[in-house]
């Protein structure tokens, strides 16, 4: 019996087609992805093949103005239109709190939403009961397939799930649920989830009874043969893991942003064992036409976005200096504003030891693309912010050793004076440079804001200590020459859309007046 698994992950509100780098589509003839194009390909495969499942491995939420405005309603609407068969919860599904998940998505989805390792407690338990499930059995042709979900247990540090959801260890939580599926005589089981490629592989290895793992979170691109675009494969598709009980378990992921549709064909024997697996992600480029009815629906929903982008978010009573003449040479107040917003966006539940889990921000000055003049009645709109942060990036959470941070700050000024983009703006950091010294030895003082304290204060950076830092995904991926960050980071979790972070902060603060205050000397 042959099953075709179509899968997406980390779509991050890319409902419209995008450019090749997943930013806003500029030249339509070269654009990719989007739900209208995805639907064309899905329907083509559904017509051609008998047993097809369309699955999503989480993080549909967060990433463009679509999510900012529609807050998840757009996800339910278009996933319903594409007739997804199941979805696993990702960490970003909790970005607007549990209510922001329940109302727009869990109550509106016409497909099961899954996670076996999220357990509700207290008053939430009855409110959310049955709205997401640990697993679901889906009929496919004349057979049934069990889908069991999982979500990153780091979600409380990456999003806003509140205090009434407990995120358990994935493997510990999955095994009993898979065992229950076995008692129902379900012998074909897919683990669908959002914990990253390393955990996907561990699940394949450790969870008895899982036949296939469909993952997300790490934006992993796997491919067999010559890759069709810019993404470099992290391994073959599918990636085969030998389980502890000796089975060959295919593991797949489909990069991110709806650029590819994962396509995996699995052949099962009559006892539900995987005999063979093959496939590849399908690049959703302009050779695949956009479905006209979905495209028309997108255009209808688009109208509200255009109206939103000109509305006032808040006011500034000072000039927001985002000029390259400032932000690439010295501390600039636009950099301070953005870094403050980045930290504010990552405030999580404090405990008696930590006031917050992260206190530091770094931001390449070259990523700040425009100032905002306060003389327009002080008004700040989404449109203004899109000029400051035009690249559609995210502000991510990484863990770095102090020694890596030191290298990053040396790189920040290694060729100072040439108006290059690597000059770092900061938050929760005090750095002193001596530019008379030779490159690589210019950082003379580097103090960082404590997290394990009740009254935050600045302490000298410790080289061997591991620190959490918020930074643009561009830097986490080694952009602007920050190869040491990419090579030495100990953990990387993708965060919220950059413009959304700053717009939310400005809306919250209502009136802003960021200063230049001696963070960089």
């Amino acid at each position: 019996w042959e099953l075709t698994i179509l899968h997406t992950n980390d779509v991050h509100s890319r409902l419209e087609q995008t450019s090749e780098d997943s930013s806003k589509c500029v030249n339509a003839s070269r654009c990719m992805g989007g739900v209208a194009r995805l639907f064309t390909k899905v329907q083509q495969i559904r017509r051609a093949e008998p047993n097809v499942l369309l699955l999503d491995a989480g993080d549909q939420y967060q990433g463009t103005i679509w999510f900012t405005v529609y807050k998840g309603a757009e996800v339910a609407h278009f996933m319903n239109a594409l007739r997804y068969d199941a979805m696993a919860l990702g960490n970003h599904e909790f970005d607007n709190g549990v209510e922001g998940l329940i109302e727009p998505l869990l109550k509106e989805a016409k497909f099961p939403i899954l996670s076996a390792n999220i357990k509700a407690k207290g008053p939430l338990a009855s409110q959310i009961s049955g709205l997401y499930l640990p697993y679901k059995v889906l009929p496919v042709g004349d057979e049934v397939v069990g889908i069991v979900g999982y979500t990153s247990k780091e979600t409380p540090f990456l999003s806003n799930p509140g205090t009434n959801l407990v995120f358990e260890d994935e493997i510990t939580a999955l095994q009993p649920e898979v065992d229950k599926l076995k008692t129902l005589n379900v012998n074909k089981i897919i683990a669908l989830g959002h914990s990253g490629f390393e955990m996907d592989k561990l699940i394949a290895q450790k969870v008895r009874g899982v036949d296939v793992v469909v993952g997300g979170h790490s934006n992993t691109f796997l491919y067999t043969g010559n890759p069709p675009s810019k993404e470099v494969p992290a391994g073959k598709y599918p990636f085969i893991v030998t389980s502890d009980d000796g089975r060959k378990v295919p593991v797949v992921q489909a990069y991110a942003f709806g650029k590819y549709l994962g396509y995996l064909k699995i052949e099962f024997d009559e006892r539900g064992n995987v005999i063979s697996s093959h496939g590849n992600p399908i690049l959703l480029n302009s050779s695949i036409p956009e479905d006209p009815s979905i495209k028309a629906d997108i255009n209808k929903w688009r109208i509200k976005l255009d109206n939103y982008s000109t509305q006032e978010l808040g006011k500034t009573i000072v000039y927001l200096d985002g000029s390259s003449q400032s932000c690439r040479f010295r501390e600039c107040n636009m950099g301070n504003l953005i870094c403050d917003a980045m930290i504010n966006n990552n405030l999580r539940h404090a405990d008696e030891t930590f006031w917050n889990h992260v206190s530091m921000c770094i931001l390449n000055g070259g990523g700040i693309r425009s100032p905002i003049d306060e003389r327009n009645n002080g008004t700040i709109t989404w449109e203004n912010l899109a000029a400051v942060l035009p690249f559609g990036g995210t502000f991510d959470l990484v863990q770095l050793k102090g020694s890596t941070l030191k290298k990053a700050f040396e790189h920040s000024v290694h060729r100072y004076g040439q108006s290059t983009g690597e000059f770092l703006q900061v938050g929760g950091i005090h750095v002193v440079y001596d530019l008379s010294r030779k490159p690589g030895d210019r950082v003379v003082k580097l103090d960082v804001l404590c997290t394990k304290c009740r009254v935050p204060s600045y302490d000298p950076l410790k080289m061997d200590e591991v620190y959490k830092v918020i930074l643009p995904n561009f830097l986490a991926n080694g952009g602007d020459g920050f190869q040491m960050i990419k090579d030495e980071l100990l953990r990387h979790d993708s965060g919220d859309q950059d413009i959304n972070v700053v717009s939310t902060y400005i809306s919250k603060m209502k009136v802003i007046y960021p200063a230049v205050e001696g963070r960089i000397k």
């Epitope: 016409k110 497909f111 009961s129 049955g130």
Partner: antibody
């Protein structure tokens, strides 16, 4: 709150086909399993079969040759047809959804209020 | 098919009594068992699922236990509104099957 309402003729002649419709309000039909269950007067409950909201079916082997369950998602309805009926098919017919917590049509909640179908000439 | 056998077929009890109904499956069904209450002229109402989980809105005087083949429904302190017929149902394999019912009557 999801509600189910059975409708159809209360009297069917022997050898004819019994046809009932269940209308679902207050929720989507697509993500759940929907069942027909019957109860002859003064007797116990018998599961007839299910349809998944996307169209797959599973029938009780004792009735399989005579049963068809179908779904119309545009109307949020699913239907039962039972052919070649006899007096033994006289029963209250209930439609029911699997409970929200059910992974595979394991238990039923909510139910319709039931409709009595009498097979008689 | 899995046969579900309920006992007793009827029980007479008074308000405040503890009532226990048992259900036996002809083969192991793990914890895939539900209990329903049915009053005359009404549809069955789900009380307990997964052998021991209380359905939302059901009073806590109802409880379920058991796994494998033997299951129990207990009403800790019978109330006037609890006089009804109770059915068990296995959700382990198809066709889904119900017990013959236990009628709880006023003594």
């Amino acid at each position: 709150q999801v509600q189910l309402q059975e409708s159809g003729p209360g009297l069917v002649k022997p050898s004819e086909t019994l046809s009932l419709t269940c209308t679902v309000s207050g929720g989507s039909i697509e993500r759940y399993y929907w069942s027909w269950i019957r109860q002859p007067p003064g007797k116990g409950l018998e599961w007839i079969g299910y349809i998944y909201g996307r169209g797959s079916t599973n029938y009780n082997p004792s009735l399989k040759s005579r049963v068809t369950i179908s779904v119309d998602t545009s109307k949020n309805q699913f239907s039962l047809k039972l052919s070649s009926v006899t007096a033994a098919d006289t029963a209250v017919y209930y439609c029911a959804r699997e409970s929200q917590e059910s992974p595979y049509n394991n238990w039923f909640d909510p139910w319709g209020q039931g409709t009595l179908v009498t097979v008689s000439s | 098919d899995i046969q579900m056998t309920q006992s007793p077929s009827s029980v007479s009890a008074s308000v405040g009594d503890r009532v226990t109904i048992t259900c036996r499956a002809s083969q192991g069904i793990s914890s895939w068992l539900a209990w329903y209450q049915q009053k005359p002229g009404k549809a069955p109402k789900l009380l307990i699922y997964a052998a021991s989980s209380l359905q939302s809105g059901v009073p806590s005087r109802f409880s379920g236990s058991g796994s494998g083949t033997d299951f129990t429904l207990t009403i800790s302190s019978l109330q006037p509104e609890d006089f009804a017929t109770y059915y068990c149902q296995q959700g382990n394999s198809f066709p889904r099957t119900f017990g013959g019912g236990t009628k709880v009557e006023i003594k």
